[in-house]
């Protein structure tokens, strides 16, 4: 039975030109986390599994940076940057858990930025 | 130039452990890589067994996992396969080759040419 | 295990032609998928990777595509060297799988 949950940063804004982190933290679960894929929409970004360390997808290779921890910083943002991303966690025994954030790139130089999401 | 080199006897007998060789030349086995193992029966597709990396952590296709072993042996560059109490469904071209998950995520660059292992009496 | 279906099995094809081979994910890989040449008694050779890139030194006619959980290999103008079984692979999730090949023979 899968128990876990997934706490995400949610609904998060930044500016145009600026950097973000996508943060995504697996709890209420003893099941192994093996790899972690992100994906914008329907296009995979990265993934950091546990063995084989990180793959950053060639498209995203400029401007898409690791960490920290299983998230991952999205950097030079442009405006169609902007829509969902998922992070997907892959465990055992449990099989797939998957997060939404939704990201908004703003224009303005007055962007208000989410709550920031912090992995204990 | 990376190069991948199997070896290991081209006949076991069923029920005895099939045990393969890969030897790396040109590049350290050390280095931030997967090494990895792929059978293909004679006129047939792909199989992937799995992989281990240099500081031996590894991965085994659930379909193989209870008879398979890798281990790796860093002084001579080598990582090795042994598949136990084996039948003639594992008469195959046994394949080692590289996973450089950095750059290429899943897919496997460096390939050795292969060596047939039949399973007969 | 995410089971990948290629088609056609095989293909006969004239040098000058352009090709189209098909593989299908049984579930989301996203663009994790990659491309291989095989020839008679050889190791597969890397063509593709991540759905659309082209491993060094692979020849330009050679390209790949994706659409959702359908992806495509194009040999733009087959060459004599071209005539060879194709594998894709997902590269999503282990284990890794390939789909069954595509043998294109001459014409």
């Known amino acids: 039975m899968m128990t876990g949950t997934i706490e995400t940063t949610g609904n998060i804004s930044a500016e145009k030109g600026g950097s973000i982190i996508l943060q995504c933290h697996l709890s209420s679960t003893t099941a192994q986390v093996t790899q972690v894929n992100w994906e914008q929409q329907d296009q995979l970004l990265a993934i950091c599994n546990a063995d084989l360390g990180w793959h950053i997808s060639p498209s995203f290779k400029d401007r898409v940076a690791p960490g920290p921890g299983l998230g991952l910083t999205l950097q030079s943002l442009t405006v169609n940057d902007t829509g969902e991303y998922f992070c997907i966690y892959h465990t055992y025994p449990d099989g797939t858990y998957t997060g939404r954030i939704f990201l908004e790139v703003l224009e303005s130089s007055v962007a208000e930025h989410g709550a920031r999401f912090q992995i204990p | 130039q990376v190069q991948l080199q199997e070896s290991g006897p081209g006949l076991v007998k069923p029920s005895e452990t099939l045990s393969l060789t890969c030897t790396v030349s040109?590049?350290?086995?050390?280095?931030?890589?997967?090494w990895i193992w792929i059978r293909q029966p004679p006129g047939k597709g792909l199989e992937w067994i799995g992989y281990i990396t240099s500081s031996g952590s590894t991965y085994y296709n659930p379909s193989l996992k209870s008879r398979v072993t890798f281990s790796v042996d860093t002084s001579k560059n080598q990582f090795s396969l042994k598949l136990s109490s084996v039948t003639a469904a594992d008469t195959a071209t046994y394949y080692c080759?590289?996973?450089?998950?950095?750059?290429?995520?899943?897919?496997?660059?460096?390939w050795g040419q292969g060596t047939l292992v039949t399973v007969s009496s | 295990d995410i089971q990948m279906t290629q088609s056609p099995s095989s293909l006969s094809a004239s040098v000058g032609d352009r090709v189209t081979i098909t593989c299908k994910a049984s579930?989301?890989?996203?663009?994790?998928l990659a491309w291989y040449q095989q020839k008679p008694g050889k190791a597969p050779k890397l063509l593709i990777y991540?759905?659309?890139y082209l491993q060094s030194g692979v020849p330009s006619r050679f390209s790949g595509s994706r659409s959702g959980t359908d992806f495509t290999l194009t040999i733009s103008s087959l060459q004599p060297e071209d005539f060879a079984t194709y594998y894709c692979q997902q590269h999503y999730i282990t284990p890794y799988t390939f789909g069954q090949g595509t043998k294109l023979e001459i014409k």
């Open positions: 040109g590049y350290s086995i050390t280095s931030d890589y997967a």
């Open positions: 991540s759905a659309s």
């Open positions: 080759a590289r996973l450089d998950f950095g750059n290429y995520g899943g897919a496997m660059d460096y």
């Open positions: 579930q989301h890989v996203s663009t994790a």
